[in-house]
Amino acid sequence: SPEVWVQVQMEATNLSSFSVHCGVLGYSLISLVTVSCEGFVDAGRTKLAVLHPEFGTQQWAPARQAHWETPNSVSVTLTMGQSKARSSLANTTFCCEFVTFPHGSRVACRDLHRSDPGLSAPTPALNLQAD
């Protein structure tokens, strides 16, 4: 069964810009990836980007760019006001859902203010670093 991982990379010099990276490990056919967050813009879950293998990508503010980084992983870059970023990040959870065949939907989340690895599948330790 495939494992999903989530990671957040922040620019050391620019707190208003950061990126969410997520991917799936194992042998599976990816049919759709959805990246979302909770507690960032409002109380509910906000869809940041949807990436389809063939038809391309779609993103919504504050996501600025979404793209495939490898056949098994994606990246979503987010930009917002620096003060908003500082105050919001502490309470934000980023989630990535991979719809794969034959395994179905797999979700992993990264909660920025807790040390647990997230939901559903193991994720590596959080790695905050400069670009």
Epitope: W5, Q7, Q9, H21, G23, L25, Y27, S28, L29, I30, P53, E54, F55, G56, T57, H67, W68, E69, T70, P71, N72, S73, S75, P124, N127
Partner: antibody, heavy 123, light 106 residues
Framework: QVQLVQSGAEVKKPGSSVKVSCKAS????????ISWVRQAPGQGLEWMGG????????NYAQKFQGRVTITADESTSTAYMELSSLRSEDTAVYYC????????????????WGQGTLVTVSS | DIQMTQSPSSLSASVGDRVTITCRAS??????LNWYQQKPGKAPKLLIY???SLQSGVPSRFSGSGSGTDFTLTISSLQPEDFATYYC????????FGGGTKVEIK
């Protein structure tokens, strides 16, 4: 222009391990996957596995699962491939290559490639 | 794993000939198919990606077509520097290479 430079040729005994390095220069390292491909003498190309340096996560071909470990060191922009329990059939040229793609779709391919590292397994 | 079968495994041709190499996937891979050229003692070189897109710097006599399970690499007019081994590669689920096709001088 990204370049991949691999470590030199190795001669190993059966049952031992070999670790081959692949140093990237001239581009971003962390957010491009590096794959390892081998080619036995007179044979075809075999994908062994690949790593995404930013997360440290690796995928492996089923054939090599449990015997190969691919790692990456972001500080030196270097990827490593370690193959254990070597046998004579592991004698091959080992290549590293960068997964390159369009970004907006899931199309990826290998470009550029390292120059190759010959690993000879002999008693 | 997805298996990639190339045919023929070798062929003899003359300069100026039209050469066609086929690659068949064991299951549908959409257009996730790349072609490489390899010369003895050298690393492979990318020719075609995404089934039909010509890599920058590759001569236009090379072309690729197909989708699903059946793919073709065509060299419209074989040149002396084209004698080499050609490999297809799927990138739909991880990666797998075909067995290769050696193009030799007749």
């Amino acid at each position: 222009q990204v370049q991949l430079v691999q470590s030199g040729a190795e001669v190993k005994k059966p049952g031992s391990s070999v670790k081959v390095s692949c140093k990237a220069s001239g581009g971003t390292f962390a957010t491009y996957a590096i794959s390892w491909v081998r080619q036995a003498p007179g044979q075809g190309l075999e994908w062994m596995g690949g790593i995404f340096p930013l997360s440290g996560t690796a995928n492996y071909a089923q054939k090599f699962q449990g015997r190969v470990t691919i790692t990456a060191d972001e500080s030196t922009s270097t990827a490593y491939m370690e193959l254990s329990s070597l046998r004579s059939e592991d004698t091959a040229v080992y290549y590293c290559a960068r997964d390159t793609g369009r970004g907006y779709t899931r199309h990826f391919w290998f470009d550029p490639w390292g120059q190759g590292t010959l690993v000879t397994v002999s008693s | 794993d997805i298996q990639m079968t190339q045919s023929p495994s070798s062929l003899s041709a003359s300069v100026g000939d039209r050469v066609t190499i086929t690659c068949r996937a064991s299951q549908s891979i959409s257009s996730y198919l790349n072609w490489y050229q390899q010369k003895p003692g050298k690393a492979p070189k990318l020719l075609i990606y995404a089934a039909s897109s010509l890599q920058s710097g590759v001569p236009s006599r090379f072309s690729g077509s197909g989708s699903g399970t059946d793919f073709t690499l065509t060299i419209s007019s074989l040149q002396p520097e084209d004698f080499a081994t050609y490999y297809c590669q799927q990138s739909d689920i991880l990666y797998t290479f075909g067995g290769g096709t050696k193009v030799e001088i007749k």
